[in-house]
């Protein structure tokens, strides 16, 4: 069991308080983390609490302000970048969200050595993206879908394509879709590592089917919102690599980087771009049916101005038993001969490891082995490989850091974290200075957490950079719930649970239980983590108790469990909330009458699924913008799980699998249904269909809609849904106000 | 405006090398905003790309005459050079230099044109 | 290299007539394909760049479209002055390279 924070003596109980429902939306029990700006290996930039940027040298000691708050204030900058030679800054204003990663803004470029703002052949706004070159102070941003270089932030703007075109063609930025399921990125250009070249991808979306909805807004008349999106089996976008020479951009124009012919054959996606020298580049291809991928290295060949991709630097990636990689196809950490690299994938043994790879995959040397999985390569120096997993102890829900002295054989391997708070660190990242020199651990609990600064060499702390003592005094005399994270084995499965326990938990007491479940394809929910969330409020004054589940299909515990779930979405995830609901009832501190499930996104279509399942077992439930039908959902997430909507695919199961085929089964449970009519991810035709499906049934169910609010319902928003979602649940558990 | 002239020898032997000179009038080669270019046109045949260079010396020229071809610029003089070596009788063309704005824009502005004539 | 492949050869009108001029790559060119004209005896004229924009001065009778590997270069309504051998040009992969020509030749 994970106390959090240490307990103050029976005697001050008195004056120890619950957790309000106004904490946690006021949200007052927030933390804070540390992540170093690194401008060099020994430098980093951090905005300080008053908002000036502050320039830190770890081996001298000294700090001093590089941008006052006064200047960021000027231009009302929220968001900032130093150019590498140090001789400009971006500011950023009027941030406008888009989606997940997407924003415009508006930048203003100041220059460090005359104090004063670059005036003449100023940036153009909204723009898109906008970053500097690795090296000097070249720009690169994005513009009304097109991309523009300038060589210097004062000098006019060159023009690298013009074919840009809102909601066809997208250059340099990712359209809905690669955003949102493949580059988790805002931006869709990569700078090689010197700067000389500027690689680049072209979404054409000409022929996307597109979602449209509206924005209420404020006018008499409510807005149309177009996005091209693919749903499952849809029309995809075609996708093209560029690569442009940035020293003379106007003459040669953008190469394009040839697609592997084995990808080629049929539809498929760019996955990702690694730059490995200036005249190197790696390029990722995944087929449409995701479980063959395809890692192409390219050299410049300067004769023809050509991005030449030999068949023998082409490495196939191919799974037999799911879909290829974890969420991700995972990308490459190449060496420092430019040619051999290091990536997670399966292992024989169905576990995701770190690989060398010199010559081909099939040669590959394996790194890191065991029946736990290696997660991230953080970085790898000359003699050392740094990484995360969860190996220790055995707790998939724990990442600690690791270091792997290649430069040595055989190679030696030590845990940089496990030791240095194990109560309260369990779960870290890190960051890391160039040549890994320092890094900083950032560590997320299960106790407070806490960021702190270490030798690259030794592995020393050298100092903490935030431990968020204000939230240790706030949280001491609060009553927060017991934690703890335990598994169940059935049927050859092993359930992971964390369990939320209020207070003055008695075993000898019965208990309302709420599952929390979210269960999506490589997702993890118990893990060892810091949080006073609304569950948490749930547990310490409402008296529930509150479990979360890891059921097949969620990751980390290898590919047995992972892909467990390929092509029969909806059935296993479901499945193993149930069985775990029964081992919780079995251990006799439940209060069988009285269990709720609920979830949001994926969660709210395996809680649907699971009040439908005619079990019996839950007497409410909630979904929060749940998927409905997989039909309904993007081709790239979709597809990598179920296949195609197709007679000779799997048209069947995507038809088997929907709410909506389940609403006779809602009549004996009390179902709340919510969703944002602005939801640009999990349209809200989403809810209507399985509302309609409810009506159709003549079912009873509560519903509540949030009138122009995304997939995230935020703002305003969140504190009516946590109000509203409480008030329903404290009804189904006769729990008084 | 802008305009481009050819000039050099109009006869040159085989195994020689070819030399010829474009004078910019109307624009300034140093004020790097084109490339200068280099075409030309064998007796009753279509166009061939020769190469192209910019103010700072960087030249791009077509792989099957590379080590052939040298370009270089004098910026002093306003004027782009062209040398091309071991000429035989496949060189014998009509050759033209051109003001250069790249892939986008292309080649705008046009010389004359030259004739060379490789004949012992 | 990619091969530009123009279509016809030679192209027989009267003036007042439409001319339609075809220039096929081997391989996607995007958009970045120019024509040009020649007269006999002198130097090529930019006539379209980007595929289908009109360089300065040049008369709105010119127009150019098509993306990938297929462009045409259309005349609406020919002038005798109209009369020449018509080049496109590709830029998108290296080297730069030329169609054989289309000679349009008065009727």
């Known amino acids: 069991i994970v106390l959090r924070p240490s307990r103050v003596h029976n005697s001050e109980e008195n004056t120890m308080r619950a957790l309000t429902l106004k904490d946690i939306l006021n949200g007052t029990f927030s933390y804070k983390t540390f992540f170093p700006n690194w401008i060099s290996g020994q430098e980093y930039l951090h905005q300080s609490a008053d908002n000036n940027i502050v320039l830190y040298n770890i081996e001298t000691g000294q700090s001093y302000t590089i941008l006052s708050n006064r200047t960021m204030k000027s231009v009302n900058a929220s968001n900032y970048g130093l150019s590498p030679d140090r001789q400009f800054v971006y500011l950023e204003s009027d941030y406008s969200k888009l989606w997940r990663y997407s924003y415009t803004a508006t930048y203003y470029i100041y220059d460090l050595s005359n104090g004063e703002f670059v005036r003449g052949n100023e940036l153009p706004r909204p723009i898109q993206y906008l970053c500097w070159s690795p090296v000097g102070s070249k720009l690169a941003y994005v513009y009304q879908n097109n991309i523009y270089l300038k060589q210097r932030p004062g000098d006019p703007p060159f023009q690298i394509t013009f074919n840009g075109r809102e909601n066809k063609i997208f250059n340099g930025i990712p359209d809905w879709v690669y955003e949102e399921e493949m580059l988790a990125t805002k931006y869709a250009l990569w700078w090689s590592p010197n700067g000389k070249f500027l690689a680049y991808a072209e979404f054409n979306d000409t022929d996307i089917p597109v979602i449209a909805y509206s924005y209420y807004g404020d006018e008499q008349y409510p807005r149309t919102i177009n996005i091209p999106y693919p749903k499952a089996g849809a029309k995809n976008p075609v996708v093209r690599i560029f690569i442009i020479d940035t020293t003379y951009p106007a003459y040669v124009g953008p190469q394009e980087v040839p697609v592997p012919a084995m990808i080629a054959s049929s539809d498929y996606y760019f996955s990702w771009l690694t730059w490995v020298t200036d005249e190197r580049v790696c390029l990722q291809w995944l087929k449409r049916v995701q479980n063959v991928s395809v890692l192409s290295i390219c050299d410049f060949r300067e004769d023809w101005q050509t991005w030449d991709c030999p068949k023998t630097q082409e490495h196939i990636e191919e799974s037999r038993t799911g879909w290829a990689g974890g969420f991700f196809v995972s990308t490459p950490v190449f060496s420092y001969d430019a040619i051999s690299y290091y990536k997670i994938f399966s292992d024989k043994d169905g576990y995701k490891h770190i690989h060398y790879i010199k010559d081909t995959v099939e040669n590959a040397i394996q790194i890191t082995s065991g029946k736990w999985e290696a997660i991230n390569i953080f970085r790898v120096t000359q003699d050392s490989l740094f990484y995360s997993s969860n190996e220790f102890e055995e707790y998939p829900g724990r990442r600690n850091i690791y270091r792997i002295s290649i430069g040595s054989y055989p190679p030696s391997k030590k845990c940089v974290t496990c030791h240095l708070r194990k109560e309260r660190c369990q779960y870290y990242t890190a960051s890391f200075s160039d040549y890994a020199k320092y890094y900083a651990l950032v560590c997320y609990g299960p106790g407070i957490p806490i960021s702190t600064l270490h030798d690259g060499r030794t592995d020393q702390e050298i100092k903490i950079l935030e431990e968020n003592k204000e939230l240790e005094n706030a949280l001491k005399n609060i009553q927060l719930p017991k934690e703890e994270i335990k598994k169940l084995e059935v049927d050859e499965i092993t359930l992971w649970y964390k369990m939320i326990l209020p207070p003055q938990f008695d075993r000898s007491k019965k208990y309302p239980l709420l599952i929390q479940v979210y269960g999506g394809p490589c997702s993890q929910s118990v893990r060892s983590v810091f949080a006073v969330n609304w569950i948490s409020y749930l547990a310490s004054k409402e008296g529930m108790v509150i479990a979360l589940v890891d059921g097949r299909g969620t990751a980390f515990q290898g590919d047995k469990l992972l892909y467990a779930v390929y092509r029969k979405l909806g059935v296993y995830e479901v499945e193993d909330q149930i069985t775990a609901v029964r081992k919780f009832i079995e251990m006799g501190f439940i209060d069988e009458k009285r269990i709720a499930i609920w979830g949001w996104s994926y969660g709210g279509y395996v809680s649907s699924l699971a009040l439908a399942s005619g079990t019996g077992l839950f007497k409410c439930g909630i979904a929060v913008a749940p998927v409905s039908s997989w039909e309904y959902y993007a081709s790239v997430y979709t597809e990598r799980f179920m296949g195609l909507p197709t007679k000779d695919d799997n048209l069947e199961h995507y038809k088997n699998s929907t709410v909506m085929a389940r609403a006779e089964y809602f009549r004996n449970v009390d179902y709340l249904l919510i969703h944002g009519t602005a939801d640009d991810n999990v349209h809200f035709q989403n809810s209507a269909q399985i509302a309609k499906a409810l009506v159709n049934a003549q079912v009873d169910f509560q519903a509540m809609w949030y009138s122009d609010q995304n997939h995230g319902l935020s703002g305003l928003s969140t504190n009516h849904l946590y109000t509203h979602m409480t008030h329903f649940l404290k009804q189904c558990f006769s729990l008084s106000d | 405006q802008v305009q481009l002239q050819e000039s050099g020898p109009g006869l040159v032997k085989p195994s020689e090398t070819l030399s010829l000179t474009c004078t910019v009038s109307?624009?300034?080669?140093?004020?790097?905003?084109?490339?200068w270019g280099w075409i030309r046109q064998p007796p009753g045949k279509g166009l061939e790309w020769i190469g192209s260079i910019y103010s700072s010396g960087s030249t791009y020229h077509d792989p099957s005459l590379k080590n052939r071809v040298t370009m270089s610029v004098d910026t002093s003089k306003n004027q782009f050079s062209l040398r091309l070596s071991s000429v035989t009788a496949a060189d014998t063309a009509v050759y033209y230099c051109a003001r250069d704005r790249g892939y986008y824009y292309n080649m705008d502005v046009w010389g004359q044109g030259t004739t060379v004539t490789v004949s012992s | 290299e990619i091969v530009l492949t123009q279509s016809p050869a030679t192209l027989s009108l009267s003036p007042g007539e439409r001319a339609t001029l075809s220039c096929r790559a081997s391989?996607?060119?995007?958009?970045?394909l120019a024509w040009y004209q020649q007269k006999p005896g002198q130097a090529p004229r930019l006539l379209i760049y980007?595929?289908?924009n009109r360089a300065t001065g040049i008369p709105a009778r010119f127009s150019g479209s098509g993306s990938g590997t297929d462009f045409t270069l259309t005349i609406s309504s020919l002038e005798p002055e109209d009369f020449a051998v018509y080049y496109c040009?590709?830029?998108?992969?290296?080297?730069?390279?030329f169609g054989q020509g289309t000679k349009v030749e008065i009727k």
């Open positions: 980007d595929a289908s």
């Open positions: 391989q996607s060119v995007s958009s970045y």
């Open positions: 040009q590709q830029r998108s992969n290296w080297p730069p390279t």
């Open positions: 109307g624009d300034s080669i140093s004020s790097g905003s084109y490339y």
